[in-house]
């Protein structure tokens, strides 16, 4: 029977060129975690493995860096990251867990008053 | 970047053992992942065992659990892998290789992640 939850860090927003970290957390269960998985709709983003530690899927090993702890950091952000993100868990005994994230990259306001205005 | 000379391999009995060495020189093996690889006639290089520069962190296939001990000696800069009980089917090239993919605390042993490779040294266990 499978116990636990995942909480995440939820809808959260970040502006363009920023960086973001995506967090979850397992509870409430024993279960062993062997492996997370961070996904992006259907991309694999990053593998963190009990045995074998991290590995970042090569299209995003330039935007993308592990931690904190079982967390992944999203860095030089674009509007194309906005999206859903899911953390999986891979424990033992209970099975699979998984938690989403919902991220909103956001155009800079710098950017945004650059716009606007010029310089004389 | 890294350079790495292994060394240790040769011809031994079944139930034997043999300590292979990996000197490494251009950079310090402490902010490295170390591994060592086998690639037998026809098959797949595979990861044998691997460590993290600071020690704290071991990985072992499950063909030679409780057989071989991988260790790092930073002073020496140098990466061993003690082989005991080995078996026919240990024969094979063992290549030394290493990585520093991402930064303290983490760590990569994956086969992807390994950049710099030594030549190789051949183990043959003969029955």
């Known amino acids: 029977m499978m116990t636990g939850t995942i909480e995440t860090t939820g809808n959260i927003s970040a502006e363009k060129g920023g960086s973001i970290i995506l967090q979850c957390h397992l509870s409430s269960t024993t279960a062993q975690v062997t492996q997370v998985n961070w996904e992006q709709q259907d991309q694999l983003l990053a593998i963190c493995n009990a045995d074998l530690g991290w590995h970042i899927s090569p299209s995003f090993k330039d935007r993308v860096a592990p931690g904190p702890g079982l967390g992944l950091t999203l860095q030089s952000l674009t509007v194309n990251d906005t999206g859903e993100y899911f953390c999986i868990y891979h424990t033992y005994p209970d099975g699979t867990y998984t938690g989403r994230i919902f991220l909103e990259v956001l155009e800079s306001s710098v950017a945004e008053h650059g716009a606007r205005f010029q310089i004389p | 970047e890294v350079q790495l000379v292994e060394s240790g391999g040769g011809l031994v009995q079944a139930g034997g053992s043999l300590r292979l060495s990996c000197a490494a020189s251009?950079?310090?093996?402490?902010?490295?992942?170390m591994g060592w690889f086998r690639q037998a006639p026809g098959k797949e290089r595979e990861l044998v065992a691997a460590?993290?520069?600071?020690?704290?962190?071991?990985y072992y296939a499950d063909s030679v659990k409780g057989r071989f001990t991988i260790s790092a000696d930073n002073a020496k800069n140098t990466v061993y892998l003690q082989m005991n009980s080995l078996k026919p089917e240990d024969t094979a090239v063992y290549y030394c290789?290493?990585?520093?993919?991402?930064?303290?605390?983490?760590?990569?042993?994956?086969?992807?992640?390994?950049?710099?490779w030594g030549q190789g040294t051949q183990v043959t266990v003969s029955s």
């Open positions: 290789a290493a990585n520093r993919r991402y930064s303290f605390p983490y760590w990569s042993f994956w086969y992807d992640d390994f950049d710099y």
């Open positions: 251009g950079s310090t093996l402490s902010s490295y992942a």
């Open positions: 460590i993290t520069g600071s020690g704290g962190r071991t």
